[in-house]
């Protein structure tokens, strides 16, 4: 969480951002809130990016003002117009690109003052893994698949029964480049699994950590998946 305060001139207002991550090819949100004003005409929101000449986005006098928007963000940005009045300056970023990563500034002017806060935005790819029993294999085998990751993640297997065990000798992980030549499909196979045990396939890079669990018993198979972004720090 980054909290910024305005300086000089008018009173300062508090602006708060939260570091976040964008999943390339999908839509992302750059979070920013501020002390609200009661009338929309006095609120100015400017989003800037370090190293970029033009603006990322500007909202003033109740509408988007995009005449100075940088070309790389053209047609890809929007504020939540209905929530500006309550202090939400968050930016929706469409079709996140790898190059969107960097330091952003959320700069706010209201009738009460000015303020700004920076936000670190990471980009990459992350997806939920699915663990299945591989019935084609000669021995009891589990197959963990996740369609999109970048940068290349690490894959670690764990089990409820053999806590702390190292499964690297009995597992095999491969990374297959997807058609857009950036993200990769992750496939990890775990051999010699035993029944009545819960196995976890953990995939992690510097952006996200995802876990796929599978519990195999004689009568049923239970699955569960979980994904967590790693860098959600507020500012």
């Amino acid at each position: 969480l980054i909290i910024g305060f305005g300086i000089s001139g008018r009173h300062s207002i508090t602006v708060t951002t939260v570091a976040s991550a964008g999943n390339i090819g999908e839509d992302g949100i750059l979070s920013c809130t501020f002390e609200p004003d009661i009338k929309l005409s006095d609120i100015v929101i400017q989003w800037l990016k370090e190293g970029v000449l033009g603006l990322v986005h500007e909202f003033k006098e109740g509408k988007d003002e995009l005449s100075e928007q940088d070309e790389m963000f053209r047609g890809r940005t929007a504020v939540f117009a209905d929530q500006v009045i309550v202090g939400n300056a968050s930016l929706r970023l469409k079709n996140v690109q790898l190059t969107d990563a960097g330091t952003y500034k959320c700069y706010i002017i209201t009738s009460k003052g000015k303020g700004n806060a920076n936000l670190e935005y990471k980009t990459g790819a992350f997806s939920m893994p699915e663990v299945n029993v591989d019935y084609n294999a000669s021995s009891e085998t589990l197959r963990c698949e996740a369609p999109r990751w970048f940068p290349q993640p690490t894959v670690v297997w764990a089990s409820q029964v053999d806590q702390g065990a190292n499964f690297s000798e009995v597992s095999n992980t491969s990374f297959e480049l997807n058609s857009e030549n950036v993200t990769m499909k992750v496939v990890s196979v775990l051999y010699n699994v035993t029944i009545n045990n819960t196995y976890s396939c953990m995939i992690e890079n510097d952006i996200a950590k995802a876990t796929g669990d599978i519990k195999v018993t004689e009568s049923e198979i239970k699955r569960r998946s979980h994904l967590q972004l790693l860098n959600s720090k507020a500012s």
């Epitope: 002390e35 609200p36 009661i38 009338k39 929309l40 005409s41 006098e61 109740g62 509408k63 117009a81 209905d82 929530q83 009045i85 309550v86 202090g87 009460k112």
Partner: antibody, heavy 117, light 107 residues
Framework: EVQLQQSGTVLARPGASVKMSCKAS????????MHWVKQRPGQGLEWIGA????????TYNQKFEGKAKLTAVTSDSTAYMDLSSLTNEDSAVYYC??????????WGQGTSVTVSS | ETVMTQSHKIMSTSVGDRVTITCKAS??????VAWYQQKPGQSPKLLIS???YQYTGVPDRFTGSGSGTDFTFTISSLQAEDLAVYYC?????????FGAGTKLELR
């Protein structure tokens, strides 16, 4: 769940003053504007003013400057409105309303004020 | 002061009708307009904000449009429970102002 609980009906004499309250719950009281709106019997809605409890900032409709005074006590998440020098024209229902997720999206049940000699 | 003019004080309608209420601002208020519903003895209830954004939990039959000075609120198919007074409200300038209200009653 966001709730705004207003104080009860008031009967007052002309020239007197009244103070009504609006207790907020279910959201961060200090982070959002609390507005006050007047509605005369059978009439429309009239904005009186608003207070930002986090900084005790107030903004008034010029028409109500000197008539209404807005305050807030952050420790118990309660906003107050004082109305002074009451006349028959002040007989109305007074609503508190906060802008939390959107424009004036939560409203109290209203406080009815009757000014009569 | 921005005056919000609702041209009809009362509108006679029937269940199933498409109802359109208009509101005209005396000056440009961009899209900073909300619409409220008020039933007798109740507090106003937010239906639409920023001229066209439906508030959480509001039925799809309620829609809003417009920008600048001309705004429209529409009920696509009137239900009996929609009989109420509807107010437009601008929050672009202070003082914040409301329209005089449009009452929907059965024909």
């Amino acid at each position: 769940e966001v709730q705004l609980q207003q104080s009860g009906t008031v009967l007052a004499r002309p020239g007197a003053s009244v103070k009504m309250s609006c207790k907020a719950s279910g959201y961060t009281f200090t982070s959002y504007w609390m507005h006050w709106v007047k509605q005369r019997p059978g009439q429309g809605l009239e904005w009186i003013g608003a207070i930002y409890p986090g900084k005790s900032d107030t903004t008034y409709n010029q028409k109500f400057e000197g008539k209404a005074k807005l305050t807030a006590v952050t420790s118990d998440s309660t906003a107050y409105m004082d109305l002074s020098s009451l006349t028959n024209e002040d007989s109305a229902v007074y609503y508190c309303t906060s802008s939390v997720r959107n424009a004036m999206d939560y409203w109290g049940q209203g406080t009815s004020v009757t000014v009569s000699s | 002061e921005t005056v919000m003019t609702q041209s009809h004080k009362i509108m006679s309608t029937s269940v199933g009708d498409r109802v359109t209420i208009t509101c005209k601002a005396s000056q440009d208020v961009r899209t900073a307009v909300a619409w409220y519903q008020q039933k007798p003895g109740q507090s106003p209830k937010l239906l639409i904000s920023s001229a066209s954004y439906q508030y959480t939990g509001v039925p799809d039959r309620f829609t809003g449009s417009g920008s600048g000075t001309d705004f429209t609120f529409t009920i696509s198919s009137l239900q009996a429970e929609d009989l109420a007074v509807y107010y437009c409200h601008q929050y672009y300038n202070t003082p914040l102002t409301f329209g005089a209200g449009t009452k929907l009653e059965l024909r």
